[in-house]
């Protein structure tokens, strides 16, 4: 066993990963209490899976239980053989109850697809165990779902192509098994932050994969490159979407959570980020008029630089329910930014700033902000995130995004923040000053800013208001207006046109 065994918190449980295999244990040795691994004194657990057809938007309604070989409930509960059929598959559970996201998702599906069959796969008895045991049960549950689908296929008019499996966390891999075991190919699987532990790097047949359905789309919201990644980091679908880089979700930081929870813990942060995938999917169902778009990119850093806002060759797609089938792609990583709550949609802009001279920059990177002024609204002051460093005599690309639709952009205010915000920067500034005491103030020159809208794919060039004044220095601002050539359209499709 390795000497340094990182302790990684998973909800309020801890998992000890050594030599690649998780050995769960809990605080004060009470894991058994937490997870209710059945003891001798407890009633014997039936290793069973139930299928509940949700016949009403009312979450309190008991619905109808379906079982293989029994056709009467299908008739009694008006199962629509020709309609879409959704199977919602929950994940591992510490409480043994259906969590509140479930009825939100059921309700959203009923709202969006009024004639559809919405089936909840209840595998709580098999999921309410040690995580490792629940993982081992996923295959069994997948088989049960496949058996149900095989039986339904025997009925007239039922088509596997109309089946959409929606699996959250561990449930995403259950969906993968179901898709793998069924006779034929299911229409679609959506993986909502598929579980990471014991699946990361696993063989294609032991996790969700593009082979499991005609179209597999995945939302990753809790991935971590350090510590334990609750959600799987690797791409496992035809398209894999990583909102906000797939890790830190807005509104889920400790500060946000503690703001509303007096005694909040890391538990709430984990739940918030992991469950965000479900809410993004719900958002895509209920806010059809506010679709969020994701853009193909090789990695999160390149996306943060604003390099990847193209819709050419199917490089962008709606996220969630409205995603377009992309069967020719596999493991295509896509990125987007979102708001902290519903509706999650933001408006992405690529900003290309050519810095043509650069005076006395010293060691520290400048801090820039932009304010965008549009025909509909003006943005807040937006930070320009410098991913690497500002390059001189080069075009520097940035990503900015706004929560509101600004309409057509009219002008841009670029501000160079004056005061250093941290002691570290202050010290670097001071050291820089000591090493170059005779140098005048820092300054750089910018003639124009090129802006591209991710959502409309339109490009526009902005020039300095005063062609003679192109310099900016700390504490100063520079104004840019639309250049005379105005809007320049490329032969790039607008994603709004591509909505299904």
């Amino acid at each position: 066993m390795s000497n340094s065994v990182p302790l990684l918190c998973f909800w309020s449980l801890c998992y000890c990963f050594a030599a690649g295999s998780p050995v769960p244990f809990g605080p004060e040795g009470r894991l058994e209490d937490k997870l209710h691994k059945p003891k001798a004194t407890q009633t014997e657990v039936k290793p069973s899976v139930r299928f509940n057809l949700r016949t009403s938007k009312d979450p309190e309604h008991e619905g109808c239980y379906l079982s293989v070989g029994h056709s009467q409930p299908l008739e009694d509960c008006s199962f629509n053989m020709t309609a879409k059929t959704f199977f919602i598959i929950h994940g591992w559970t510490m409480s043994g109850i259906f969590e509140n996201w479930l009825h939100k998702l059921v309700s959203a599906l009923h709202t969006r697809e009024k004639d559809a069959n919405v089936v909840v796969v209840d595998w709580l008895p098999l999921a309410h165990q040690l995580y490792t045991d629940a993982v081992n049960n996923t295959r069994v549950v997948g088989h049960s779902i496949a058996r149900m689908l095989d039986w339904l296929q025997e009925k007239d008019d039922f088509s596997l192509g109309n089946v959409h499996l929606i699996g959250y966390s561990l449930g995403a891999h259950v969906a993968g098994y179901a898709g793998n075991f069924v006779k034929g190919t299911v229409g679609r699987i959506t993986g909502l932050d598929p579980a990471g532990p014991m699946f990361e790097g696993a063989d294609i047949h032991k996790r969700l994969s593009p082979d499991d359905a005609d179209f597999v789309d995945v939302l990753h919201t809790y991935t971590r490159s350090f510590g334990l990644s609750i959600g799987i980091q690797m791409p496992v679908g035809h398209i894999d979407i990583y909102p906000n880089g797939g890790d830190f979700q807005p509104g889920c930081g400790l500060n946000d959570v503690l703001g509303s929870i007096a005694y909040g813990t890391i538990t709430e942060v984990v739940k918030c980020e992991h469950e965000r995938a479900v809410h993004l999917f719900v958002d895509s169902l209920v806010n059809q008029d506010k679709p969020s778009f994701a853009f193909q990119c090789t990695d999160s850093n390149r996306f943060k630089k604003g390099i990847c806002l193209s819709c050419r060759k199917n490089r962008c797609n709606s996220i969630g329910y409205n995603a377009k089938k992309m069967r020719n792609k596999r493991n295509s990583k896509m990125y987007l930014k979102t708001r902290a709550g519903m509706p999650f949609r933001v408006y992405h802009y690529q900003m290309k700033i050519h810095v043509f001279s650069y005076k006395n920059m010293g060691e520290i990177e400048p801090t820039f902000y932009v304010t965008l002024y549009g025909t509909n609204a003006d943005s807040q002051t937006l930070p320009l995130e410098i991913v690497e460093r500002i390059e001189q005599n080069a075009t520097n690309t940035f990503l900015v995004y706004t929560e509101e639709d600004l309409g057509d952009l009219l002008k841009i205010q670029l501000t160079w923040e004056g005061a250093s915000q941290s002691w570290y920067n202050l010290w670097k500034e001071f050291r820089s000053y000591l090493s170059q005491p005779r140098n005048p103030g820092r300054e750089l020159n910018i003639r124009r800013i090129r802006v591209k809208s991710g959502e409309t794919q339109r490009k526009l060039t902005f020039c300095t208001e005063d062609p003679e004044n192109t310099s900016i220095s700390p504490g100063r601002e520079l104004w840019f207006r639309k250049c005379r050539d105005g809007w320049r359209m490329k032969n790039e499709t607008s994603p709004t046109v591509e909505l299904p």
Epitope: Q42, T43, E60, S95, E99, N100, W101, H103, S260, Y263
Partner: antibody, heavy 120, light 112 residues
Framework: QIQLVQSGPELKKPGETVKISCKAS????????MNWVKQAPGKGLKWMGW????????TYADDFKGRFAFSLETSASTAYLQINNFKNEDTATYFC?????????????WGQGTALTASS | DIVLTQSPASLAVSLGQRATISCKAS??????????MNWYQQKPGQPPKLLIY???NLKSGIPARFSGSGSGTDFTLNIHPVEEEDAATYYC??????????FGGGTKLEIK
């Protein structure tokens, strides 16, 4: 109509075992979870835990781990609460109450309660 | 565990007037726009009876003079106009995703 009918009051000596029942009617027993709630004389309500009526898996609140056991007789649509090694502080009225698995988990129907008293 | 604190512990209200009972949670009981707070009425020798679920939804069959409001950590049960039969003890309860599902200490309502 929906009803939860509990067994009658009992007088128990400390150290004894007691088992009270809650018989459900008017709905499909296995489609709703069953809670147990304690109310000591003149005091408030205290949630003891719940049992999944389909799988039989119980969940206990921290204060009720050890001497308390929930069980089922599914064929009779009945849930049971057993208290081992009865103590004076177990003197209370115990209620069963159902909740929907799929909804917001409020307790929509309650049994009439079973009073348990410690006799010296 | 989420602790629910009810106030006042008891109150006396004249017939026809308004009774207001408060319930404060030690942490938010909200989830995605819904509040997982319920209110029950208990009369002596009887089991509790559900009045309000999800903070403001009236259970069918409960008179409209009962209403619930609030979100996050602060919730209120209002009874207006108070009637003789409303003399009882009222409890708030949270049913968030993570049990234990806790009750408030109760508020005893007397009719003057």
């Amino acid at each position: 109509q929906i009803q939860l009918v509990q067994s009658g009051p009992e007088l128990k000596k400390p150290g004894e075992t007691v088992k009270i029942s809650c018989k459900a009617s008017g709905y499909t027993f296995t489609n709703y979870g069953m809670n147990w709630v304690k109310q000591a004389p003149g005091k408030g309500l205290k949630w003891m835990g719940w049992i999944n009526t389909y799988s039989g898996v119980p969940t206990y609140a921290d204060d009720f781990k050890g001497r308390f056991a929930f069980s089922l007789e599914t064929s009779a649509s009945t849930a049971y609460l057993q208290i081992n090694n009865f103590k004076n502080e177990d003197t209370a009225t115990y209620f069963c109450a159902r909740f929907s698995y799929y909804g917001r988990h409020y307790f929509d129907y309650w049994g009439q309660g079973t009073a348990l008293t410690a006799s010296s | 565990d989420i602790v629910l604190t009810q106030s006042p512990a008891s109150l006396a209200v004249s017939l026809g007037q308004r009774a207001t009972i408060s319930c404060k949670a030690s942490q938010s009981v909200d989830y995605d726009g819904d509040s997982y707070m319920n209110w029950y009425q208990q009369k002596p020798g009887q089991p509790p009876k559900l009045l309000i679920y999800a903070a403001s939804n009236l259970k069918s069959g409960i008179p409209a003079r009962f209403s619930g409001s609030g979100s996050g950590t602060d919730f209120t049960l209002n009874i207006h106009p108070v009637e003789e039969e409303d003399a009882a003890t009222y409890y708030c309860q949270q049913t968030t995703d993570d049990p234990p599902w806790t009750f408030g200490g109760g508020t005893k309502l007397e009719i003057k």
